[in-house]
Interface confidence: low
């Protein structure tokens, strides 16, 4: 048993919709008689090894859980003692205990149940940024950008919506772009503008609301 060791964090926390990289090193005895390749899998605690599929595996012949397919990835190569796990589009129901299993046909089959990974997926607490370049001048077009710099590139791209109940310059109430181009009018001053960002991979939406400050150039008439 001493030769079977796994070094990984005991606990990892990630916010829903985001990604996390779990570094992991795995050690197993080097038996010369075992000629088969080393394959590794991450499994959720409590599953039957014979009935349930893993959440991620390096074995191309093995199926993985539908719920984690495409989201959980065994990044590391177990043959190189690397069992690193990458999770994208984290979902609340991913929360749980996970363990690593190594297989080397025909003799080696070992589950590292003494070194389990506790994964906690918490509510998304971050909000988008709304970036306004300079001042909003009545009658002049402006580009507003809704930004989520904390989102991970490997995740499902988020969708953007812009909402306002009183923005007279918007031809429609929503647009699916992270950049909103509009020409503010004097009557838009003080209205609220909301950017909604939906992470469809996790089914979660966050938003940021600002109050528009529309200025008039000197010489413009007040209504």
């Amino acid at each position: 048993d001493l030769e079977f060791q796994l070094v990984a964090p005991e606990s990892v926390t990630v916010e829903e919709g985001l990604c996390v990289h779990v570094p992991c090193s795995v050690f197993y005895p080097s038996i010369k008689l075992t000629l088969g390749p080393v394959t590794g899998s991450w499994l959720r605690k409590g599953v039957s090894l014979h009935e349930d599929s893993p959440v991620a595996t390096s074995d191309p012949r093995q199926l993985v859980q539908k719920a984690t397919q495409g989201r959980f990835q065994l990044l590391g190569d177990p043959q190189k003692h690397d069992c690193s796990l990458f999770i994208r589009d984290a979902q609340k129901n991913d929360t749980g205990m996970y363990f690593f299993r190594v297989v080397r046909e025909p003799f080696v089959r070992y589950s590292y149940k003494k070194s389990q990974l506790s994964l906690h997926v918490t509510s998304l607490s971050r909000t988008p940024d709304i970036i306004i370049p300079g001042t909003l001048e009545a009658g002049y077009p402006s580009n507003l950008t809704c930004s989520v710099p904390w989102a991970c590139e490997q995740g499902t791209p988020p969708t953007f919506s812009w909402m306002s109940t009183a923005l007279t310059s918007l031809s429609s109430r929503t647009t699916d772009s992270s950049v909103l181009t509009f020409t503010p009018q004097p009557q838009d001053h003080g209205t609220k503008l909301t950017c909604l960002v939906t992470f469809s991979g996790a089914g979660v939406t966050v938003e940021r609301t600002i109050q528009l400050n529309v200025t008039r150039k000197s010489g413009q008439m007040r209504e």
Partner: nanobody, 120 residues
Amino acid sequence: QVQLVESGGGLVQPGGSLRLSCAASGGTFVINAAWYRQAPGKQRELVASISYGGSTNYADRVAGRFTISRDNAKNSLYLQMNSLRAEDTAVYYCRLDPGLALNNRPLYYWGQGTMVTVSS
């Protein structure tokens, strides 16, 4: 001024079903929406909530029996209640969150409540 109109409450036998509706007038845009309930002599508690993207959350005691849904185009919120029990008897309120703040405090809109009585 935003006004919420709730409907669908009433008297139902244990094991029966009801569908509550909450319609918002006044043109507000709703980001998150939720149903709360308050039983006689008890504090108001969250029953279920739903985000604009459709992500839902349920109190443990109603999970599997109640379903929250919304129609963004109609600014309407619904609560389908199945397998009702006597302990579900309460005044049910809808709460809409337009994602706005007033003096740095979140602004919520509450309905006037609709009574649900589960009794044989």
